[in-house]
Amino acid sequence: EVEKTACPSGKKAREIDESLIFYKKWELEACVDAALLATQMDRVNAIPFTYEQLDVLKHKLDELYPQGYPESVIQHLGYLFLKMSPEDIRKWNVTSLETLKALLEVNKGHEMSPQVATLIDRFVKGRGQLDKDTLDTLTAFYPGYLCSLSPEELSSVPPSSIWAVRPQDLDTCDPRQLDVLYPKARLAFQNMNGSEYFVKIQSFLGGAPTEDLKALSQQNVSMDLATFMKLRTDAVLPLTVAEVQKLLGPHVEGLKAEERHRPVRDWILRQRQDDLDTLGLGLQGGIPNGYLVLDLSMQEALS
């Protein structure tokens, strides 16, 4: 807190300019009018103030706008945004995508800070949903943004926004998140032809059910092993050897290298050994010939 002192004669700031960097903290407090500061925020961004000086400028704005800054000021905060706390940001009402972009630009190249997370949260809540333009913007700055949302938050993403999602945006998503995103992606890409559809849906397949994987196996998609390994285990288990062979196409040979890892390991345990042998890959661990396979889940459903 800077104590109140009178501004020395001739030092009253008429505008925000470079000369202010040589003002001591108490001089900034005494000689810079908060209203002038608010109207010339865009200039502050150009001037290389120290962090200590920025503290004083922030304090002046806080006094002027105790209920939270107006968007006209927020949009021009520039690097003063780095001085804001999540508590400060919770008081804001940010509605313009341009304002959001301007503040994200300040934090570019850094991890998502608590300030940025709060800003995004306020913005998205204000809009009511994650529309395509917002998602485009957020994933451009933070490729992992989508996977930082809870399944509940993801449910507000409209299918149309899925077009903005790139494969790398889903790299850190877990199965629960993909369970929410997959049906939206399926809906978004439903009018595409077979090969184009597969290219688009591929990143979302970690949320696909068995019946969709069976359908894909009929379309000569040649799924790569990396995608196959990300599929839900419960969706892979019911697939037959023939279906997996069709699904993977030439990539089926990669199963051997993954036979000890999920979901391949669990899938092998569910197949007849003689069916696995037809692949000619030397996969071991299937059900020996002559054994009866009981589908207990089916039996439970009948009872």
């Epitope: 470079e18 960097i21 040589f22 003002y23 001591k24 903290k25 961004n45 150009a46 001037i47 290389p48 120290t50 962090y51 200590e52 000086q53 690097y79 780095l82 300040v106 570019k108 190249g109 850094h110």
Partner: antibody, heavy 121, light 107 residues
Framework: QVQLVQSGAEVKKPGASVEVSCKAS????????MHWVRQAPGQGLEWMGI????????GYAQKFQGRVTMTRDTSTSTVHMELSSLRSEDTAVYYC??????????????WGQGTMVTVSS | DIQMTQSPPSLSASVGDRVTITCRAS??????LAWYQQKPGTPPKLLIY???SLESGVPSRFSGSGSGTDFTLTISSLQPEDFATYYC?????????FGGGTRLEIK
């Protein structure tokens, strides 16, 4: 990796001007301030001024006001420092150093290798 | 301008010693202070920023403390590579100013 590479040594006559350049790489040039610091032989460090590469705003120490000019070229991620009306006491190693804005502190975390400027008749 | 006074100007110590260098500001600078190490023919290297934060990659034997006007750099157990000149610097307000330096020599 993040680095600042400065131009080579200079020998100048009194009254002349010298320009030292500092090329940044490995980070977003416009997201950090650049400072110039000099060190006379066997002496301590002296801050000369600062430039904000984003808008070109500058601030110069009183001692160098009117003699120093700092500019930047965003197309080449280079800052330049020109010192005019040279005198023998300007003989020093001149350093550019990065600090502030996008870093977590105003401290100088990256320094150029230094440029020796000798002023001699 | 804010004056930074470093003491002692020079210091002799042995490997393994605990060494303390102090820096005093002529006015309150909060925690806007850095410590640098410089070896002959090379640029300074940032050790400590914001009075007590250790710069990434700097050995933990270096530590900084203080706020307001009095600050300290401590090297808990001197290593051969630590013999150099150390500078404090304030970045509370312009012009930014450095201490006169402390030359740490082998005893």
């Amino acid at each position: 990796q993040v680095q600042l590479v400065q131009s080579g040594a200079e020998v100048k006559k009194p009254g002349a001007s010298v320009e030292v350049s500092c090329k940044a790489s490995g980070y977003t040039f416009t997201s950090y301030y650049m400072h110039w610091v000099r060190q006379a032989p066997g002496q301590g460090l002296e801050w000369m001024g600062i430039i904000n590469p984003s808008g070109g705003s500058t601030g110069y120490a009183q001692k160098f006001q009117g003699r120093v000019t700092m500019t930047r070229d965003t197309s080449t991620s280079t800052v330049h420092m020109e010192l005019s009306s040279l005198r023998s006491e300007d003989t020093a190693v001149y350093y550019c150093a990065r600090g502030g804005y996008s870093s977590s502190s105003d401290a100088f975390d990256i320094w150029g290798q230094g440029t020796m400027v000798t002023v001699s008749s | 301008d804010i004056q930074m006074t470093q003491s002692p100007p020079s210091l002799s110590a042995s490997v393994g010693d605990r060494v303390t260098i102090t820096c005093r500001a002529s006015q309150d600078i909060s925690s806007a202070l850095a410590w640098y190490q410089q070896k002959p023919g090379t640029p300074p290297k940032l050790l400590i920023y914001d009075a007590s934060s250790l710069e990434s990659g700097v050995p933990s034997r270096f530590s900084g403390s203080g706020s307001g006007t009095d600050f300290t750099l401590t090297i808990s157990s001197l290593q051969p590579e630590d013999f150099a000149t150390y500078y404090c610097q304030q970045f509370s307000s312009y012009p930014l100013t450095f201490g006169g330096g402390t030359r740490l020599e082998i005893k």
